[in-house]
């Protein structure tokens, strides 16, 4: 209907115009995890903070045991950051050891997880070798891109290893989706 | 009023609808840093390009004296990207030194100042140790999250040292928002 | 339009209203590049999946030969990720060999390239120091942000050594915009 | 240190129009909020109105906004109140606050009586 | 408006008792302020945001609530806490004040 007047009333017009700020929308914060059972080739996922200080889900888009469910088809912006902190990773002792030195990593995944597909899908991934030379070292991944969502769809952030997951912040690690 | 055809005109539709072109939205640019003074506890914010090169604000989103202003309440999606850069990090002259190897570091914050808080918020922060073993040593931190912000609410980028931001190109380091 | 009830249908209402259902849209994932030429002073440009697993394009948003079209004049927010990896990096092999310690880098642009202008435009830079002390590295390069472009404007990824980029997961290395 | 400096004239005739100034000192006001707080003899609080330096953005208090008016002087750094149609009901303690970003700063009032 | 009604008006109490003071708001807030303010003097924030401490505040001071009820405690009063306190939400315009709370010493 770009830049056009209103059609006269007995016309319809099909396009699903609505209101923006009746869209589903939700910005998680970190919360101190406490460990939970996963598959043996999936890494942890994280729960999240859905209602207090930053954080927040609306319009129909909720929050529920580590999961933001999806309540509408559409395309999604979804984002993530993780801070991770650690002591000095194995690599650089393993280094000062002689041995070979296999960095060590650090990955953020977030994953879809939909009725009609049987395998989680990996939508995004953020991952980086930590060989860190300094006793203790701390840094973020951030991911962010746009999906096409179905009605029902469950998505969650994923890490390598949630001990190393920086939780002290609202800031500092996050999870988000909102609909275009 | 999704999926739904415009109803007769004796009608009363009262969702907000509104078109997207006339929304709040800024991209600033980096600029050459001048010091001014800040709080002790607080780090110093940068300031921006708002007109020139790739730079804008539009629909009542302003930018003055570091700040933007939010002209209307609602859902913000706020971006930023500090390319930081400098020479070897004392980290790695202390380890040679053998001395304690507290690592470096460099930090981003969106911050928020709202007149309903007599603190300011910290909305997103990115934070990383900074113990390279080259000489001279460059990287970015982004950020971007959804937040809801009130009319009236103003936002800054802070950073941990304004002598390592790299100012010398517009897409190195940059500042935005846009209501969703 | 604003919690406004529709006008009578005899009046006009010239704001752009439109579903958000049909705007530009894509996100486009990464495919194992093969060698193209290239200007000597500009990066390679990658090229992309825009059909298969995550990738889409749509509503006049096309995919040709490593470029996004922009079909339509507006505000969008862009984005890619580009996940390096390498074996040590020569800055460290350099080290140890008492020659002086220049970094080497990696360097992701999203590049616009328009009619009215003769020269790219890079519209948003990515570039990090690359010292690793490990033998194998691997780190995302993120980049996000909002711009005014016009129709018939192309957005292309470059990247500073197209071998190092990691093809191998679409949820790794991606590409992609929106019209707001 | 962060001070705040209300001045103006101790005495305003029935009618005529209230003018305060306040005079930051120690801090950018444009990087907070300023407002105006009074309160009447023997009275609570009641807040008037404030403003954002940084915008020139003002909130007033519904009950007052026909006569209130609150602007700035970045320049100077300084935030300007003016009441008109005064009666003797405005006769009070008008405090000049920062407040928004920072923690709360009070000027230490200026006392304005409103007589002929 | 938002009405800020503040209990009780006045009251006395030994030093080292733990005094409570409410404040009722007419709709939900997310931020509650309490201030003190003696005699001749500019109010002092004592507490933000419902419950944080303002800088510089004794720990014995501290306040708890949400939505619309709100309670400011001293926990053990003391003679130079002789003052009058206002609750204040600063979300609804106007921003409003409490009637205040006279606390004196037996």
């Known amino acids: 209907l770009k830049g056009q007047e209103f059609a006269p009333s007995h016309q319809q017009v099909y396009a699903p115009l609505r209101a923006d700020g009746d869209k589903p929308r939700a910005h998680l914060t970190v919360v101190r995890q406490t460990p939970t059972q996963h598959f043996k080739n999936q890494f942890p996922a994280l729960h999240w903070e859905h209602e207090l200080g930053l954080a927040f889900t609306k319009n129909r888009m909720n929050y529920t045991n580590k999961f933001l469910l999806i309540p509408e088809s559409g395309d999604y912006f979804i984002y993530s950051q993780v801070t991770f902190r650690g002591m000095t990773s194995e690599c650089s002792e393993i280094r000062q050891a002689g041995r070979p030195n296999k960095p060590d990593s650090i990955t953020v995944v977030i994953t879809k997880v939909t009725d009609s597909y049987p395998e989680p899908t990996q939508l995004l991934m953020g991952t980086k070798s930590v060989c860190e030379v300094g006793s203790n070292w701390f840094q973020p991944i951030y991911l962010g891109a746009m999906f096409s969502l179905q009605e029902g769809d469950k998505l969650m952030v994923n890490v390598s290893d949630i001990s190393l997951v920086d939780y002290t912040k609202e800031d500092k690690t996050f999870f988000g989706a909102f609909l275009l | 009023l999704k999926g739904q055809e415009f109803a007769p005109s004796h009608q009363q539709v009262y969702a907000p609808l509104r078109a997207d072109g006339d929304k709040p939205r800024a991209h600033l640019t980096v600029v050459r840093q001048t010091p001014t003074q800040h709080f002790k506890n607080q780090f110093p914010a940068l300031h921006w390009e708002h007109e020139l090169g790739l730079a804008f604000t539009k629909n009542r989103m302003n930018y003055t004296n570091k700040f933007l202003l939010i002209p209307e309440s609602g859902d913000y999606f706020i971006y930023s990207q500090v390319t930081f850069r400098g020479m070897t990090s004392e980290c790695s002259e202390i380890r040679q030194a053998g001395r304690p190897n507290k690592p470096d570091s460099i930090t981003v914050v969106i911050t928020k100042v709202t007149d309903s808080y007599p603190e300011p918020t910290q909305l997103l922060m990115g934070t990383k140790s900074v113990c390279e073993v080259g000489s001279n040593w460059f990287q970015p931190i982004y950020l971007g999250a959804m937040f809801s912000l009130q009319e009236g609410d103003k936002l800054m980028v802070n950073v941990s040292d304004i002598s390592l931001v790299d100012y010398t190109k517009e897409d190195k380091t940059f500042f935005g928002a846009f209501l969703l | 339009l604003k919690g406004q009830e529709f006008a009578p249908s005899h009046q006009q209402v010239y704001a752009p209203l439109r579903a958000d259902g049909d705007k530009p849209r894509a996100h486009l994932t990464v495919v194992r590049q093969t060698p193209t030429q290239h200007f000597k002073n500009q990066f390679p440009a990658l090229h992309w999946e825009h059909e298969l697993g995550l990738a889409f394009t749509k509503n006049r948003m096309n995919y040709t030969n490593k470029f996004l079209l922009i079909p339509e004049s507006g505000d969008y927010f862009i984005y890619s990720q580009v996940t390096f990896r390498g074996m040590t990096s020569e800055c460290s092999e350099i080290r140890q060999a008492g020659r002086p310690n220049k970094p080497d880098s990696i360097t992701v642009v999203i590049t616009k390239v328009t009619d009215s202008y003769p020269e790219p435009t890079q519209l948003l830079m990515g570039t990090k120091s690359v010292c690793e002390v490990g033998s194998n590295w691997f780190q995302p390069i993120y980049l996000g942000a909002m711009f005014s472009l016009q129709e018939g404007d192309k957005l292309m990824v470059n990247v500073s050594d197209i071998s190092l980029v990691d093809y191998t997961k679409e949820d790794k290395t991606f590409f992609g915009a929106f019209l707001l | 240190q962060v001070q705040l400096q209300e001045s103006g004239p101790g005495l305003v005739r029935p009618s005529q129009t209230l003018s305060l100034t306040c005079t930051v000192s120690?801090?950018?006001?444009?990087?907070?909020?300023m407002h105006w707080v009074r309160q009447r003899p023997g009275r609570g609080l009641e807040w008037m109105g404030r403003?954002?330096?940084?915008?020139?953005?003002?909130k007033y208090n519904p009950s007052l906004k026909s006569r209130v008016t609150i602007t700035r002087d970045t320049s100077k750094n300084q935030v300007s109140l003016r009441l008109s149609s005064v009666t003797a009901a405005d006769t009070a303690v008008y405090y000049c606050?920062?407040?928004?970003?920072?923690?709360?700063?009070w000027g230490q009032g200026s006392l304005v009586t409103v007589s002929s | 408006d938002i009405q800020m009604t503040q209990s009780p008006s006045s009251l006395s109490a030994s030093v080292g008792d733990r005094v409570t003071i409410t404040c009722r708001a007419s709709?939900?807030?997310?931020?509650m302020y309490w201030y003190q303010q003696k005699p001749g003097k500019a109010p002092k924030l004592l507490i933000y945001?419902?419950?944080n401490l303002a800088s510089g505040v004794p720990s014995r001071f501290s306040g708890s609530g949400s939505g619309t009820d709100f309670t400011f405690t001293i926990s053990s009063l003391q003679p130079e806490d002789i003052a009058t306190y206002y609750c204040?939400?600063?979300?609804?315009?106007?921003?409003?004040f409490g009637q205040g709370t006279k606390v004196e010493i037996k």
């Open positions: 606050v920062m407040s928004g970003g920072v923690p709360d700063v």
């Open positions: 120690g801090f950018d006001i444009q990087d907070t909020y």
């Open positions: 403003i954002d330096p940084a915008s020139g953005h003002t």
């Open positions: 709709q939900g807030v997310e931020y």
């Open positions: 945001g419902a419950s």
């Open positions: 204040q939400q600063w979300e609804g315009n106007p921003r409003t």
